[in-house]
């Protein structure tokens, strides 16, 4: 008789999750000399203990702890890009700027980066079928508190000036309810971290206006503000500038506003 | 810092005091605005963002205005009444900070009188 | 509004002694921990001592520490001396500025 399965609105752990997060970290740790030591087979019994035979619903960032602790890294705590929303850019910002680091370029980060994954109750199997989603099923999912336990710790690492990037295209440039609104901001850690710059990535070509007065800046000025850390706030009207100037800071036309 | 422009003024003349620093600019730091009636307690005006927002207390709200130049922070009162006379303190968020206040002025005093 | 309370006021102690200052908040302060203590003596302004709390500013005597969350903070000086005879205000930060505000003060007068 086949068992009943609960059906979530999210959809299914990635396909060949297992492998995927084993093949990632053998490649991270062959990439990364100073991750060399890490055994990714402990690793990957890591990860699963924390959502294997766990109710999908009722996961804590305690669970995560073993697999925190495997993971450790130190990366230069003056050299961290937080994002919102604008993912790719910040990824193709770290690949060029090489000392800068977004999570997803730490070995944890980089794991679980574009995966989805949950277990069931009482069962040692993946669901492959359907995962909770985070506003129509729980926010205590295996994905959402991983996210949640890995961006904290890396927000109390930073240190001295911490860049964000955030999507000038959205109606809401910065939200509270965001991951590095409702978590990264609020765990950067005022006796280390003395300023937050923001860079707002306009989206149009002809996109001059200034979006640091957004209000959502503005609060997100304040909030900052409040905790002790100074706020600094950019445009940067061409992304694909930015980055090519970024590659070649030495270009004639890299002198002017980008 | 140092604040200056605190003299004797009529009730309804409106009247701007100066912040400035040496050493370093005010324009790359929060400066908050305080002020003390004579023989009573501090009370928080205001304060300025390097950014220049701009935030109030309750009770100040249409009645100041903080503002910035390049070098210094001004605190113009609109409209004085008696219960405005008090000295001014302006005090900068430096070398680091935003509302922690580590660097005051030595307060210039305003009286406004008929 | 906010409203910060300190007790007591005037306090009296004697030189080596130890003062506790207390000051309550009407409501949290932002992060539960955005409250700062000054002292301030006569004609002079006021001295930032302690800020987010418990974090003592630069050049300040450790014999001065807050402590705190929330609502309920206080500043303790221990093995007082004469020269501590001041003027102490907390001040308060809240999410909503408009809030902000200094304690009532506390006198601090010296045997």
């Known amino acids: 008789v086949p068992r009943w399965r609960q059906q979530w609105s999210g959809p299914g752990t990635t396909k060949r999750f297992p492998e995927t997060v084993l093949a990632r970290c053998v490649k991270y740790t062959e990439i990364h000399p100073e991750m060399r030591h890490v055994d990714c087979q402990s690793v990957w019994d890591a990860f699963k203990g924390a959502f294997i035979s766990k109710h999908p619903c009722n996961i804590t960032e305690e669970d995560y702890q073993p697999l925190m602790k495997l993971g450790t890294q130190t990366v230069p705590c003056n050299k961290i890009l937080l994002w919102s929303r604008i993912k790719d850019l910040a990824h193709q910002f770290t690949q060029v700027q090489r000392d800068m680091f977004t999570l997803e370029d730490t070995l944890l980060g980089y794991l679980a980066d574009d995966l989805t994954w949950c277990g069931e109750f009482n069962t040692s199997k993946i669901n492959y079928q359907s995962c909770p989603d985070w506003r129509k099923d729980c926010s205590n999912n295996p994905v959402s508190v991983f996210w949640k336990t890995v961006s904290r710790r890396f927000a109390e690492a930073a240190c001295d000036v911490v860049h964000v990037m955030l999507n000038g295209s959205r109606s809401k440039i910065f939200d509270k309810n965001s991951t590095f609104g409702s978590v990264e901001v609020h765990n950067l850690q005022p006796e280390k971290v003395q300023t937050l710059e923001a860079w707002v990535i306009h989206g149009g070509r002809e996109d001059s206006r200034d979006l640091c007065q957004d209000p959502t800046i503005k609060e997100l000025e304040s909030i900052i503000s409040k905790r002790n850390i100074q706020f600094s706030c950019k445009n940067i009207y061409r992304p694909d500038k930015f980055l090519q100037c970024v590659k070649n800071p030495e270009d004639s036309s890299c002198t002017s506003e980008i | 810092v140092e604040e200056s422009g605190g003299r004797l003024v009529t009730p309804g003349t409106p009247l701007t005091l100066t912040c400035t620093a040496s050493g370093f600019s005010l324009s790359r730091y929060y400066v908050t605005w305080v002020r003390q009636a004579p023989g009573k307690g501090l009370e928080w005006i205001g304060i300025?963002?390097?950014?220049?927002t701009t935030y109030y207390a309750t009770w100040a709200k249409g009645r100041f205005t903080i503002s910035k130049s390049a070098t210094t922070v001004d605190l113009r009162i609109a409209s004085p009444t008696t219960e405005d006379t008090a000295t001014y303190f302006c005090?900068?968020?430096?070398?680091?900070?935003?509302?922690?206040?580590?660097?005051w002025g030595p307060g210039t005093l305003v009286t406004v009188s008929s | 509004a906010a409203v910060l309370t300190q007790t007591p006021s005037p306090v009296s102690a004697a030189v080596g002694g130890t003062v506790t200052i207390k000051c309550q908040s009407s409501q949290s302060v932002v992060n539960a921990n955005n409250l700062s203590w000054y002292q301030q003596k006569p004609g002079q302004p006021p001295k930032l001592l302690i800020y987010l709390a418990s974090t003592l500013a630069s050049g300040v005597p450790s014999r001065f520490s807050g402590s705190g969350s929330g609502t309920q903070f206080t500043l303790t000086i221990s093995s007082v001396q004469s020269d501590d005879a001041a003027t102490y205000y907390c001040l308060g930060v809240y999410d909503d500025d408009g809030d902000n505000a200094f304690g009532g003060g506390t006198e601090v007068v010296v045997k």
């Open positions: 300025i963002y390097i950014s220049g």
């Open positions: 005090a900068a968020a430096w070398p680091v900070g935003t509302y922690v206040l580590p660097l």
